[in-house]
């Protein structure tokens, strides 16, 4: 058929970058190159009906399906998915070619299946058909990793009962606070399942398989850190093991450890201590306490105590299901075009969450970072003064939770103009979302200053383009109207645009780029 | 089959404008975009603008902006492209191609000489 | 604009010997198309997206690259590839078009 490509499909894979995965803070999506789904005409089918190549997506993945029309002007569409409709927005590259995407954030296999895209240009209509399918993955899973006692040994092992069998390493740091990050030179990993070296500031055990990577910290406290403002706090789900370990450093070796439950000490067999001297002769005690599978009467305050420092606690509270707590009301936000802003959403969750940011069904990678008062904060600083509805959403395969903000920017409108036979039409961005006037231009008002006061509908906030709202004016032409000169002007409290227009019959029409104050 | 018919070699004056044009046939012509694409002798190949027949939406590049012009009619499938002010560097062939939405070149016209010379 | 220099300028190759011609792009572009026209003809295309073959080229040629850098191979030169090959890229607004790499055959 000579009249092809003029459509091109393609799928963009969106990885998750394994070195920054690990962070189990964040949830970063890296676009690899698009793969050219070849969208070829489908024979014997009424209308123009395209069918790209099968997509396979691995459980958990996201992906873009997206479609290239060499069409410029107005193009509209609509996506169809199991019977239900879903908002479709399309946009022009600088190729002028539109672009029209369907975004699948974490593919799970209810996403799977026929996506169906209608598109409707002043040329032609096309039907474009998609099929994602689950790539045979679906027995495997990644479980964070947890600890046992290695048998006869004062030792830890790390163990994560994943499919396929993961990877499993020891990241172990001697730093404090940021120096301890992933790629720090502080940071030490060690690819094997068992650890001797239990006396390190921070340890963490990870596991990485085709699903990605998790981990889990060794919780600790030390006795020769000053104490939280606020108590440290464990959650646990029923089942779960838990491990603390409690740290102390002394000039000699004469002092010990012990940990209490509720003012109780602890059961026996449900501890054990080491010790060692350090480079510089100090001593150093680490005191586990650890139950294999906590029940509901294991929560509580436990407290390690040491014959010379002072005793600190942390809350243990476990768990029937996980959770995430945090407001979920939406929130609105106006700026200035330059203001400095992030969005901002703190919570507290158990397991760790996996997390996204979501602009225009494009998302951006999600840090967060634990606080001290047992919470987590997620910023998102990366909005590039874009207007719209952003999506901040959490998981962490016992809860979900979105929240949902508003971003305006205050800016003055720029108005676009267009007409056809019967009326011209005003549209303009800007907020606040601005006011219409319509003017007459004639030899009794050179300047424009005669006002039309009939014919004219404003529909305000009636569309979003690119998340971004959109005012419209337009004012229905009269015969006595034709070939006369008229201006549409919106204006808010930051300024005035205006557009000259000739009502004129169709065709192409000259738009005069007017006063704007 | 496509076809991009261009009209024949033309010899004239510096200062004089030229309008060379390009018939289509064997596709949907307002489906696509016509490119114009300048070659002089044993030189490379320079994009000068396009037009997209279905509504004349018009793209140029910045160094022929202000001396082409770019049209179409609809009604007998052709492209034209009028230069003005010529020079002797406009002296070159003139290519008229079809674009895809893959971004390239799938289909040329034979191409038409364009000789400016005193 | 993005600068598209294509090496070399000129090369010669004898019958059944490997050919690679690069282009290097002045900043990232997502695909590299090329033509390749012979003396008094209008360009042909050649290869699209990078790596793929236009309806009738010949397999022993093949396209690669990403980001700044692409390249043209042919794997056993013929005496009718002998030709001037231009890479293209669309990246940006404006099209551009490498100078040219013209093969001949010794």
């Known amino acids: 058929n000579q009249d092809l490509p003029v459509i091109k499909c393609v799928l963009i894979n969106h990885k998750n970058n394994d070195s920054s995965v690990g962070k189990s803070s964040s949830y970063p999506m890296v676009s690899e190159s698009p793969e050219d789904l070849g969208c070829a005409l489908r024979p014997q089918s009424a209308g123009t009906v395209y069918e790209a190549a099968t997509v396979e997506v691995d459980v958990s993945a996201s992906i873009t399906l997206q479609v290239l029309v060499d069409t410029p002007g107005n193009i509209s569409c609509l996506w169809v998915f199991k019977h239900s409709s879903l908002n479709c927005q399309p946009h022009f590259d600088v190729q002028n070619r539109g672009v029209v995407s369907m975004v699948i954030l974490k593919m799970t296999e209810t996403q799977a299946g026929e996506y169906l895209l209608f598109i409707q240009s002043e040329a032609t209509n096309y039907t474009i058909v998609f099929t994602v399918s689950i790539r045979n993955t679906l027995l495997f899973t990644l479980r964070r990793p947890y600890f046992r006692k290695m048998e006869n040994q004062d030792a830890l092992v790390c163990i994560s009962e994943s499919v396929p069998e993961p990877i499993v390493e020891w990241v172990l740091c001697d730093s404090q606070g940021e120096s301890c990050k992933e790629e720090s030179p502080a940071v030490v990993k060690k690819e094997e399942k068992v650890l001797h070296e239990l006396f390190g500031t921070d340890i963490r055990c990870c596991a990485r398989n085709e699903l990605g990577r998790e981990c889990t910290r060794l919780f600790t406290i030390d006795l020769n850190q000053t104490p939280q403002t606020t108590l440290p706090q464990l959650f646990l789900k029923v089942g779960e093991p838990l491990w603390i370990r409690c740290k102390a450093v002394h000039v000699n070796h004469g002092f010990g450890l012990t940990w209490e439950l509720e003012n109780k000490a602890l059961e026996e067999g449900s501890y054990f201590e080491m010790s060692t001297y350090s480079t510089n002769r100090t001593m150093i005690r680490i005191l586990f306490a650890f139950v294999s599978s906590v029940a509901r009467n294991d929560t509580g305050y436990y407290t390690c105590s040491s014959s010379k420092h002072p005793s600190q606690s942390a809350l243990v509270t476990i768990v029937e299901k996980g959770f995430i707590n945090a407001t979920n009301s939406s929130e609105d936000y106006e700026i200035d075009q330059y203001e400095e802003f992030c969005f901002s959403v703190r919570f507290k969750a158990y397991p760790q969450i996996r997390c996204t940011w979501t602009f225009s069904r494009k998302a951006f990678p999600c840090e967060q970072k634990a606080l001290d008062d047992g919470y987590s904060v997620s910023k998102f600083c990366n909005h590039k003064h874009q207007p719209g509805e952003y999506i901040f959403h959490a998981e962490n395969g016992d809860a979900q939770f979105t929240k949902m903000f508003t971003l305006n920017i205050r800016r003055k409108p720029q108005v676009l103009a267009e007409a056809s036979a019967s009326q011209a039409s005003c549209s303009s961005d800007g907020y606040p979302l601005p006011s219409w006037t319509w003017k007459k231009c004639s030899d009794k008002s050179p300047n424009c200053t005669e006002d039309i006061p009939e014919g004219v509908w404003n529909r305000k906030a009636n569309r979003k383009v690119f998340g971004q709202w959109v005012s419209s004016s337009t004012l229905n032409m009269s015969e006595a109207m034709k070939g006369f000169l008229v201006k549409c002007c919106a204006y808010n409290s930051l300024g005035t645009s205006c557009e000259t227009i000739l009502l004129n019959s169709p065709g192409p029409f000259p738009f005069i780029q007017d006063s704007i104050s | 089959e496509v076809q991009l018919q261009e009209s024949g070699a033309e010899l004239v004056q510096p200062g004089a404008s030229v309008r060379l044009s390009c018939k289509a046939s064997?596709?949907?012509?307002?489906?696509?975009?016509i490119n114009w694409v300048k070659q002089r002798p044993g030189q490379g190949l320079e994009w000068i603008g396009n037009?997209?027949?279905?509504?004349?939406?018009?793209n140029y590049n910045e160094n022929f902006k202000n001396r082409a012009t770019l049209t179409v009619d609809t009604s007998s499938s052709t492209a034209y492209m009028q230069l003005s002010s010529l020079t002797s560097d406009d002296s070159a062939v003139y290519y008229c191609?079809?674009?895809?939405?893959?971004?390239?070149?799938?289909?040329w016209g034979q191409g038409t000489t364009l000789t400016v010379s005193s | 604009q993005i600068v598209l220099t294509q090496s070399p300028a000129i090369m010669s190759a004898s019958p059944g010997e490997k050919v690679t011609m690069t282009c290097s792009a002045s900043?990232?572009?997502?695909?590299m198309h090329w033509y390749q026209q012979k003396s008094g003809t209008s360009p042909k295309r050649w290869i699209y997206?990078?790596?793929k073959l236009a309806s009738g080229v010949p397999a022993r040629f093949s396209g690669s690259g990403s980001g700044t850098s692409y390249s043209l191979t042919i794997s056993s030169m013929e005496a009718e590839d002998a030709a001037t090959y231009y890479c293209?890229?669309?990246?940006?607004?404006?099209?551009?078009f490498g100078g040219g790499t013209k093969l001949e055959i010794k």
């Open positions: 191609a079809r674009r895809v939405v893959y971004l390239y070149f799938d289909y």
């Open positions: 064997g596709y949907t012509f307002t489906s696509y975009w």
């Open positions: 037009i997209y027949p279905g509504s004349s939406i018009i």
């Open positions: 900043s990232s572009v997502s695909y």
């Open positions: 997206d990078t790596s």
């Open positions: 293209q890229q669309w990246t940006s607004k404006s099209p551009t």
